[in-house]
């Protein structure tokens, strides 16, 4: 569910939303740490209907969801985390 990408791309998100998305509509969450041309952390939510939403990393709901997913992944099955090396 959680994916962390380190890329050399510039910012991917033009507009960010803080609107809550229920877990049942989320396929995966992609986290792009700041750096490499983008001065901010970006969170991209891939919904089950194939649409993509950039979420404000400061939104309480996404912080809470990521924390719950992290806890779950450390206590049960590992959540897939994909990392790309910085060129």
């Amino acid at each position: 569910v959680l994916e962390v990408y380190y890329t050399s791309l510039r910012c991917r998100c033009v507009q960010e939303s803080s609107v809550f998305i229920p877990r049942r509509f989320i396929d995966r969450i992609q986290i792009l740490p700041r750096g490499n041309g983008c001065p901010r952390k970006e969170i991209i939510v891939w919904k089950k209907n194939k649409s993509i939403v950039c979420v404000d990393p400061q939104a309480e709901w996404i912080q809470r969801m990521m924390e719950v997913l992290r806890k779950r992944s450390s206590s049960t099955l590992p959540v897939p985390v994909f990392k790309r090396k910085i060129p």
Epitope: V19, F20, I21, P22, R23, R24, F25, K48, N49, E60, W61, R64, M65, V68
Partner: antibody, heavy 120, light 107 residues
Framework: EVQLVESGGGLVQPGGSLRLSCAAS????????MSWVRQAPGKGLEWVAE????????NYAPSLKDRFTISRDNAKNSLYLQMNSLRAEDTAVYYC?????????????WGQGTTVTVSS | DIQMTQSPSSLSASVGDRVTITCKAS??????VSWFQQKPGKAPKLLIY???YRYTGVPSRFSGSGSGTDFTFTISSLQPEDIATYYC?????????FGGGTKLEIK
């Protein structure tokens, strides 16, 4: 004005079938997730099923998924619930509800309900 | 399934009173909670969504709070027209589930 109008309820014998309809007007029906919710006499609310705009994502209450089928026809602005092998405990008022993605899929509009009575 | 335990199941209060209803989820539902008002013979009406957001046209005396597993619905000053049954609902994950309801009566 948004309107959801359910129909198709009535008296049916145990083991019988019914098809409920929900006609939508005043909204871009093809844009919204929709749900069916039921309420047995004197009891609380129970979610039945939901369907996405494209009919590609469907979820059911686990206890009902073998007997109930949700579907929709966007061209007719209509939502349906096919109910088979009906039991006395399916007796309830059945509501259709819109789930607004701007309000994170909360059920913001409801129909007035249609009554299903399962009895011999 | 996520259970929503709502309390109290019934409540008697006077006009002008502050009324509080609580709902506890059996597991984390983030802020995926709605509160509905239902009057006899009528369909439920959405009052609060995403735990704390007041729906369009809902009077400011109605409010909601909470996240995770503990949620609260408050009527700051009870009015005669608020007599109804109130339900919480989680829509974080399927199956969607409702609390058992709180029947509110005037003293």
């Amino acid at each position: 004005e948004v309107q959801l109008v359910e129909s198709g309820g009535g008296l049916v014998q145990p083991g019988g079938s019914l098809r409920l309809s929900c006609a939508a007007s005043g909204i871009d029906f093809s844009r919204y997730w929709m749900s069916w919710v039921r309420q047995a006499p004197g009891k609380g609310l129970e979610w039945v099923a939901e369907i996405n705009p494209e009919s590609t994502l469907i979820n059911y209450a686990p206890s009902l998924k073998d007997r109930f089928t949700i579907s929709r026809d966007n061209a007719k602005n209509s939502l349906y619930l096919q109910m088979n092998s009906l039991r006395a405990e399916d007796t309830a008022v059945y509501y259709c509800a819109r789930q607004d993605d701007y309000r994170n899929y909360a059920m913001d509009y409801w129909g007035q309900g249609t009554t299903v009575t399962v009895s011999s | 399934d996520i259970q929503m335990t709502q309390s109290p199941s019934s409540l008697s209060a006077s006009v002008g009173d502050r009324v509080t209803i609580t709902c506890k989820a059996s597991q984390d539902v983030n802020t995926g909670v709605s509160w509905f008002q239902q009057k006899p013979g009528k369909a439920p009406k959405l009052l609060i969504y995403s735990a704390s957001y007041r729906y369009t046209g809902v009077p400011s005396r109605f409010s909601g709070s909470g996240s995770g597993t503990d949620f609260t619905f408050t009527i700051s000053s009870l009015q005669p027209e608020d007599i109804a049954t109130y339900y919480c609902q989680q829509y974080y994950s399927t199956p969607l589930t409702f609390g058992g309801g709180t029947k509110l009566e005037i003293k």
